[in-house]
Interface confidence: medium
């Protein structure tokens, strides 16, 4: 069976039907490049006006305009708000009332696309394996990133969150149109990784999505993650404005100027520093969501009532922090280089600025307790990775799980830890699962490109797709079309239950109280320390500021600094970094 032309609110669309075997039978209908919205530069997205005739939806559209990996050029385009759909089909009748899984990609709110990285036409976020193995519809889409997606003056002139509103428009489009593709509009699961996972979390918290989302999965990211909300958007807006020659004193004039500036210039005006800086790298993630009083009406911690009826799976990778540790403490990955106490303390203090010296000291002390017994470089390096994993991923996720559970009415809550070790040959032998290592398994790459993987990798992928798609179908990862290796019990506040995802999942994979000592430290000991306010520190910005971003500002409840100009010698910067 195949769909043929499908009528949507914008007009007819026609995709391609791909047979899954030479003998015929099962197939998948694939639609690529359906427009779901339009947007002008630094404006909220609007519904797409539609088209005449039949839209041939056979090719991925270009990603939203963003800097290349070298940050010295751009690729993609401004006209980028398109989505892609995979619909599994049986032999005889076309599918109907299938669960729908809408994917939100990660990339630090700075990069990425709905199709994902591409090697020889093998796209990372190809939805085929999930769709066909789990018998669900998969939708991926593009949203605006970087300055074009998240630049904000912190007021009505440029409220920001354009990328989040794009995501919402995609979800709303799916709600309105997916029935025509055989999907159940009342059973939409949104899932995402990293910035996409935080986006999933933010979408569930936003009042704009009331009634749109039935379930959600966040893989390595939450609205509560310290890198997910920008507390001082005006600082970064002014930084960009200065670079492109726009006025900065009046936000109205600045916004008007920025909106008519070449989008490529806006995009290239910001560079994420990838070499070690004074602060941890996540502090330089400038263009990310903001609390705008509208789409995100309040601090995310206060919005959990909005998730009372949304089933949730949330988890992290056991060494999610490794990627960030390699930037902040480069010696972590270098066998011939050593990590020192000073390196680690500098990292710790950079992540605990709000609590001043006492916060840094207490954090340093608890994390280095094991060093007296085992002062080996392996142990010290693992501590650095564990610390970054805790601060950036584990603690926010655990707090979010607890909030979700505490506010749940009909909603169910599940937690996991992905521990299947990275396959990167250059990594240290002690390496676990790095940030984004889970993606290939969720998207079925060990099946799509079997020669690149081992049987154990396929076991992991099979289990994850089974749990994920069962959850999308029923709200319970154990119940659905796919058999699972062991029963995944829901998260409880008392036990902190989680599933440890490895190559061999058994009943012993259900565990409790992940890193409880450290969770208690952050939630209790660290939390009660007095917050340091109004502190300044003086940093010398990099000489060539085309290379890196300026020093990050504080939460704008503190003194708002003057961003460094190209010729400044020292930049004043309050020490609290809005974590």
């Amino acid at each position: 069976a195949k769909l043929g032309a499908v009528y949507t609110e914008g007009g007819f669309v026609e995709g391609v039907n791909k047979k899954l075997s030479l003998l015929g039978g099962d197939s998948v209908d694939i639609f690529k490049g359906i427009p779901f919205a339009t947007a002008k530069t630094l404006e909220n997205p609007q519904r797409h006006p539609g088209w005449q005739g039949t839209l041939k939806a056979t090719n991925f559209k270009k990603r939203c305009l963003q800097a290349t990996i070298t940050q010295d050029n751009t690729y993609g385009q401004e006209d980028c708000l398109y989505l892609n759909i995979w619909v599994p089909q049986g032999r005889k009748q076309v599918s109907h009332n299938l669960p729908v899984m809408v994917w939100i990609y990660g990339g630090a709110f700075l990069m990425g696309s709905g199709q994902g990285a591409n090697f020889l036409k093998n796209y990372l976020y190809d939805g085929e394996e999930i769709a066909t193995r789990g018998n669900v519809i998969v939708v991926t889409f593009n949203y605006r990133v970087g300055p074009l997606g998240f630049l904000s003056t912190g007021d009505a002139n440029l409220p920001g969150n354009f990328g989040l509103r794009d995501q919402h428009m995609a979800i709303a489009w799916v709600k309105r149109n997916i029935a025509a593709f055989g999907g159940d509009p009342d059973n939409i699961t949104i899932f995402g990784e990293s910035a996409g996972a935080a986006s999933v979390s933010l979408q569930t918290l936003s009042p704009y999505n009331k009634g749109l989302i039935r379930r959600a999965i966040s893989q390595s990211g939450m609205a509560l993650s310290p890198w997910a909300i920008q507390k001082n958007p005006l600082f970064w807006a002014k930084t960009i404005a200065k670079k492109v020659g726009c006025p900065t004193e009046d936000t109205g004039k600045m916004a008007a100027c920025l909106k008519i500036t070449d989008p490529r210039a806006l995009t290239l005006a910001y560079k994420l520093p990838v070499k070690k800086q004074e602060y941890p790298v996540v502090h330089y993630l400038a263009f990310i969501p903001v609390i705008d009083g509208d789409f995100i009406p309040d601090d995310p911690i206060n919005l959990y009532n909005n998730t009372a009826d949304i089933d949730y799976i949330a988890g992290i990778n056991n060494m999610d922090g490794h990627l960030f540790a390699t930037i902040d403490v480069p010696a972590v990955d270098k066998t011939k280089q050593t990590v020192t106490e000073e390196d680690f303390y500098r990292l710790v203090s950079g992540h605990t600025v709000a609590k001043g010296l006492k916060g840094a000291q207490a954090t340093f002390d608890i994390y280095t307790e094991s060093w007296a017994q085992d002062p080996s470089q392996e142990n010290m390096k693992k501590t650095v990775v564990a610390f970054e994993t805790d601060v950036l991923f584990l603690i926010p996720t655990e707090i979010a799980l607890a909030q979700h559970k505490a506010h749940a009415k009909s909603a169910k809550t599940y937690s996991y830890l992905f521990s299947h070790p990275s396959r990167m040959p250059i990594y240290p032998k002690w390496m676990g699962a790095d940030h984004a290592d889970d993606l290939q398994y969720v998207f079925g790459k060990p099946f799509a490109t079997p020669l690149g993987y081992r049987p154990q990798d396929r076991a992991v992928s099979k289990a994850m797709i089974a749990y994920w798609t069962n959850f999308a179908r029923s709200g319970d990862p154990n119940m659905g079309n796919s058999p699972v290796p062991t029963h995944w019990y829901p998260y409880t506040l008392e036990n902190g239950n989680y599933l440890d995802i490895t190559k061999t999942i058994t009943s012993a994979s259900m565990k409790e109280h992940l890193r409880e000592k450290f969770l208690k430290f952050w939630a209790v000991t660290f939390e009660v320390l007095p917050t340091v306010t109004g502190d300044q520190d003086t940093l010398t910005p990099p000489e060539d500021d085309s290379e890196v971003a300026p020093d990050p500002p504080s939460d704008d409840s503190q003194v708002v600094p003057v961003p460094p100009t190209d010729d400044s010698v020292e930049a004043q910067m309050p020490a609290t970094i809005g974590f």
Epitope: R346, V353, L357, A360, D535, L539
Partner: antibody, heavy 119, light 105 residues
Framework: QVQLVQSGAEVKKPGASVKVSCKAS????????MHWVRQAPGQGLEWMGV????????SYAQKFQGRVTMTRDTSTSTVYMELSSLRSEDTAVYYC????????????WGQGTLVTVSS | DIQMTQSPSSLSASVGDRVTITCSAS?????LHWYQQKPGKAPKLLIY???KLPSGVPSRFSGSGSGTDFTLTISSLQPEDFATYYC????????FGQGTKLEIK
């Protein structure tokens, strides 16, 4: 990149007070303790006290209790050490020194300020 | 206060010599640190936590010991090593040893 820059030399009369400053840069000022250590001519190093720039808390060596006051100004990332009731034996080079990490050795030192007490 | 006693107070040695300086604490301490000071300059951290070298410190310097007795060793003296060396403890109120002056023979 860590720099501690101290104020210039001072000459004081016995009974007077002196206030030495130490301006920090290149790191998060509130994340590291700052100590004051002095060294009389031809003598060894003598710890005077420490200030937590985060909250202004101080701890002084018994010998200097009542005579020394350490303060900080977070807006300028500067710490100050004031020593009162000066005597000739207070003639020394006064150093500010920052923790290396946590509660650790003194990893970074100012260039020193010579205070001469003479009638 | 914990008293720190260094020995010897001074010693003469030649370039290429192996030199050992000891530091004794009046009671057991967790960590001991060593500093090098040249005339007219601020002290410089040489060894921390008894045996660890900060970046930039040559590997000819080494430290050992625990409890109350600690040692600083320079395996092969270089001309720039002639200076005064201080031990330092941070277990209670910080205190320094009286210093060991290393001179050219």
């Amino acid at each position: 990149q860590v720099q501690l820059v101290q104020s210039g030399a001072e000459v004081k009369k016995p009974g007077a007070s002196v206030k030495v400053s130490c301006k920090a840069s290149g790191y998060t000022f509130t994340s590291y303790n700052m100590h004051w250590v002095r060294q009389a001519p031809g003598q060894g190093l003598e710890w005077m006290g420490v200030i937590n720039p985060s909250d202004g808390a101080t701890s002084y060596a018994q010998k200097f209790q009542g005579r020394v006051t350490m303060t900080r100004d977070t807006s300028t990332s500067t710490v100050y050490m004031e020593l009162s009731s000066l005597r000739s034996e207070d003639t020394a080079v006064y150093y500010c020194a920052r923790d290396y990490y946590g509660s650790s050795p003194l990893g970074y030192w100012g260039q020193g300020t010579l205070v001469t007490v003479s009638s | 206060d914990i008293q720190m006693t260094q020995s010897p107070s001074s010693l003469s040695a030649s370039v290429g010599d192996r030199v050992t300086i000891t530091c004794s604490a009046s009671q057991s301490i967790s960590y001991l640190h060593w500093y090098q000071q040249k005339p007219g300059k601020a002290p410089k951290l040489l060894i921390y936590a008894a045996s660890k070298l900060p970046s930039g410190v040559p590997s000819r310097f080494s430290g050992s010991g625990s409890g109350t007795d600690f040692t600083l060793t320079i395996s092969s003296l270089q001309p720039e090593d002639f200076a005064t060396y201080y031990c330092h403890q941070r277990s209670s109120y910080p205190t320094f040893g009286q210093g060991t002056k290393l001179e050219i023979k």
